[in-house]
């Protein structure tokens, strides 16, 4: 029967005795930075090219006993998780391997650094179909390595790593921190984050989405047709190599940010246990696991948008926090998350001519999170319009007055240290969904877009007193650009985006006693792309 | 491996008084940077990768390896250059002692220096 | 469940040789590197060997060098200590231990067994 | 003879906060990663820190761990009658290619 980990990465309309979706990943060439291989292994014989790049360091310890099948094991297991025969995810992908790792596992830096320019090197000599770089592998934090695989992204190379097995911010780590490469945790069969003894998958915002990676049955180094399960963030990196692969082969021209945002698209939501995770990185971490499209074409009318955290501000007065979104996506809003409450709101401000989300600590505050909705949106021309705080009674308003021009996203800043001691207006005016309304000492932000067919609307979900939480969901066909919260009280820790999901948290003064001002409103602004649909419909 | 201690006498204790002349200063007002692994049993000291501002040309970088080489036998360190980076990042692997960093900090063109460090199959 | 069950220990004469066992149970015993670790009466731990998670190395005290063999049967989900030319000195209760992590991290150790007692004695 | 040397003992009345030192050298705690365990009387020693201050599953915030140059320091907060126990450090030693513990410190809770 079909392992576990192909059935889950599967859509059903493909899911038969068999794991056979079309079209393997033949365009696309892989390649895994990793041990030595056994090449002639039957699951990969003939699939993978081990190219003559090696850069190991030596063995540790006196009495290391080299065999191959040892030193071969886990790039082997992982060659055949990407493109194997019987076992592998992309059955029509080739792969080159490169030796980066010792027979212990164990590389360094400078080897893969080395690695990475012998792979931009042989793009430049022979160029070929779409590239996929796998790197299921991890060091600490190192800026070097990140930097080689932003010069390597941006060279038009899709790179694959894995979060590593730590148990531990993904951050914290290279490659996985880097942000231009789509880093994968591990779940297992029960969508459960991977435990690794007393460590296990990493999590964090560093990680772009979760994949099969527990008792991954691939092949075996230890003879031509053998097979063993092997666990880690390196198996669930190599899931997602393959859905790549498979992807970029339907479609060739995909950008790293389509198919990044394709990926979190088509991923199942919501299923792993975040009570696994530390209290301070469930909301940080994705709640995601990748699967293959239900078809290879069509996708294209979506408007896809994913939610992008920055790093915490740190608790200084005067600490900001930034989110940035990839140069090819368009910053659609731009909210704010404080544990504490203590925060100052954000803004969308301009950054080396590219659009970053800004969020403001407040005095006593632990910390914030700016939190950037990331968006791919085709000819867009996006502003920000700002009005300063209307010191009035019925609070700050701004709107997108430019023709053609609709509202995707709303901000607000304020200099007070709490808005909660001042009164927030009770109501917001309806009938006017192209306009921002926000605390009347706070200035408002409005991101105003101009896109063929883009159409947005404005919902809203409000509850009598903070409980806690408060949520809006965009529904079917539209996609969350906006997420913000009405009025902005103290009450509010902050807003963000998880999925189609508009999320407002809020302290739960239900203990303290409430009034009917200390309502809570999540704003979930909504938009879709009848461009995109339209154009998608005539190709079909 | 090629960067094994045997193969220090190899090494250039003394290059042309001409590449010493060249300033050993950076550009005015920027101030290159050292990082290293926060991690400390994954440190691989000894080992550096010298990065150079983004559009630095490959003759720069090996001007700027060699001239590390020189000003380093002049205090009387062995250095080598374990590779030349060219593609990615301009840079070049150097097999240095600590002591030098101060030195190859204040070198034209450098942007920051990386001490070497252990990744793990995961 | 994790467990670790020693076994094997007893009363041996000094010269003699004796082998220890341990069945592991509730994880996936070749991926990770397991440690003996023994304790004398009324003293503190002290470490005696390592092995990595497929048998490709092994490590020792020096107390030890020599004389005891480390080594498991990962398919049978056990370790072992061989203890030859053994010494008044070695009575102690012996313990497996598992390695935090399935690699190259040298983390310590999460999961003890109960130990088992050997003692060395005329 | 341990090259990880530690107190032998220390003591403080219920609620109150220890501190355990440990102290090494580079080729050990200054390089390596540094493993705190209790030892209950009459059982095995469990884990109690990893990482030099990464806490297992199931271990109480109480325990802490941190690293300065080559010493470590273990800190038990609250302290609770449960925790009177035999405390050692333990990490690797580059030098020797072994594993090393410190000589161990007895906690005592008071009253």
């Known amino acids: 029967s079909i392992p576990w980990n192909l059935e889950r990465i599967t859509p059903p309309r493909y899911r038969a005795d068999e794991y056979q979706p079309p079209d393997g990943g033949s365009l696309v060439e892989v390649y895994l930075l990793d041990t030595s291989i056994q090449s002639d292994h039957r699951e990969i014989e003939g699939r993978v090219m081990v190219t003559d790049f090696e850069n190991v360091p030596e063995e540790d310890g006196t009495r290391f006993h080299r065999q191959a099948s040892k030193c071969d094991s886990h790039g082997t297991h992982l060659a055949g998780v990407v493109s194997g025969r019987d076992a592998g995810v992309a059955k029509g992908a080739s792969m080159r391997s490169l030796r980066v790792l010792n027979c212990q596992g164990k590389g360094t830096v400078s080897g893969t650094l080395i690695g990475l320019e012998f792979i931009r090197k042989s793009q430049l000599v022979q160029p070929v179909g779409p590239l996929v770089v796998l790197l299921p592998l991890a060091g600490g934090y190192s800026r070097v390595l990140n930097a080689a695989c932003q010069r390597l992204a941006r060279a038009g190379v899709v790179l694959v790593t894995a979060a590593g097995n730590f148990r531990d911010d993904a951050c914290l780590y290279s490659p996985a921190s880097a942000p231009e490469v789509i880093t994968v945790g591990a779940t297992n069969a029960q969508d459960q984050p991977v435990t690794l003894g007393t460590l296990g998958t990493n999590f964090g915002r560093c990680v772009d989405l979760f994949a099969p990676g527990e008792d991954i049955i691939g092949a075996s180094s230890d003879c031509s047709t053998c097979f063993v399960s092997q666990s880690g963030t390196s198996q669930a990196a190599a899931h997602v190599a393959g859905i790549a692969a498979m992807m970029l082969s339907a479609e060739p021209e995909l950008t790293l940010a389509e198919l990044r945002q394709r990926l979190i698209h088509f991923s199942a939501k919501d299923v792993i246990n975040e009570a696994w995770f530390p209290e301070d990185q469930r909301v940080l971490t994705p709640n995601l696991v990748a699967a293959l499209p239900p078809s290879t074409h069509g996708a294209g009318w979506q408007l896809f948008c994913r939610t992008v955290w920055s790093a915490h501000s740190g608790p200084t007065r005067m600490a900001t926090a930034i989110a940035r979104c990839a140069p090819d996506e368009e910053l659609l809003s731009c909210s704010s998350f404080s544990r504490s409450g203590k925060r100052r709101g954000e803004r969308m401000e301009a950054q080396g001519g590219k659009l970053v989300c800004r969020a403001h600590n407040a005095f006593g505050g632990e910390g914030v999170y700016a939190i950037a909705r990331c968006c791919l949106l085709p000819q867009a021309n996006c502003s920000v319009h700002t009005a300063p705080p209307a010191e009035a009674s019925m609070g700050t308003r701004v709107h997108c007055h430019q023709q053609g021009h609709v509202l995707t996203g709303c901000s607000s800043h304020w200099e007070v240290e709490d808005l909660g001691t001042h009164k927030p207006p009770v109501l917001r005016p309806r009938g006017q969904p192209n306009q921002c309304v926000g605390h009347r000492e706070a200035s408002i932000h409005a991101s105003c877009c101009h896109a063929p067919g883009l159409e947005c609307k404005v919902k809203e979900h409000g509850i009598p007193a903070p409980q806690g939480q408060v949520t809006v969901a965009c529904e079917e066909g539209w996609t969350l650009t906006g997420c913000s919260a009405l009025p902005g009280t103290s009450h509010v820790l902050g807003a963000y985006a998880v999925d189609n999901t508009c999320v407002v948290r809020s302290r739960d003064v239900s203990t303290t006693g409430s009034t009917s001002e200390e309502a809570v409103t999540a704003v979930a602004i909504c938009c879709r792309s009848r461009h995109l649909a339209q154009a998608s419909q005539e190709l079909q | 491996q090629e960067d094994e201690d045997g193969d220090y006498e190899e090494l250039v204790l003394a290059l042309r008084s001409e590449e010493d002349g060249l300033a050993e200063a950076p550009e005015h007002g920027t101030t290159a940077t050292f990082h290293r692994c926060a991690k400390d049993p994954w440190r691989l000291p000894g080992t550096y990768v010298v990065v150079l501002k983004e559009e630095t040309h490959l003759s720069q970088s090996e001007r700027t390896a060699r001239r590390l080489q020189a000003q380093a036998a002049r205090r009387g360190y062995l250095t080598k250059i374990l590779h030349v980076f060219h593609g990615l990042l301009p840079g070049f692997l150097v097999k240095m002692s600590g002591d030098l960093l101060e030195l190859a900090l204040k070198l034209p063109h450098v942007d920051y220096i990386e001490e070497d460090s252990s990744v793990f199959a995961q | 469940e994790v467990h670790l069950v020693e076994s094997g220990g007893g009363v041996v004469q000094p010269g003699r040789s004796l082998r220890l066992s341990c069945a592991a149970s509730g994880f996936t015993f070749n991926s990770f590197g397991m440690h003996w670790v023994r304790q004398a009466p009324g003293k503190g731990l002290e470490w005696v060997a390592l092995?990595?998670?497929?048998?490709?190395?092994?490590y020792y005290a020096d107390s030890v060098k020599g004389r005891f063999t480390i080594s498991r049967d990962n398919s049978k989900n056990t370790l072992y200590l061989q203890m030859n030319s053994l010494r008044a000195e070695d009575t102690a209760v012996y313990y497996c231990a598992r390695a935090i992590a399935a690699l190259y991290y040298y983390y310590g150790m999460d999961v003890w067994g109960q130990g088992t007692t050997v003692t060395v004695s005329s | 003879e341990s090259v990880l040397t530690q107190p032998p003992s220390v003591s403080a009345a219920p609620g109150q906060k220890v501190t355990i030192s440990c102290s090494g050298s580079?080729?050990?705690?200054?390089?390596?990663?540094v493993s705190w365990y209790q030892q209950l009387p009459g059982t095995a020693p469990k884990l109690l820190i990893y990482?030099?201050?990464k806490r297992p599953s199931g271990i109480p915030d109480r325990f802490s761990g941190s690293k300065s140059g080559t010493s470590a320091t273990l800190g038990i907060t609250g302290l609770q009658t449960g925790d009177e126990a035999d405390y050692y450090c333990g990490t690797w030693d580059s030098s020797l290619s072994a594993y090393v513990f410190g000589t161990g410190t007895r906690v005592t809770v008071l009253g």
């Open positions: 092995i990595w998670s497929d048998g490709s190395d092994e």
């Open positions: 580079s080729s050990n705690i200054g390089n390596n990663f």
């Open positions: 990482d030099y201050n």
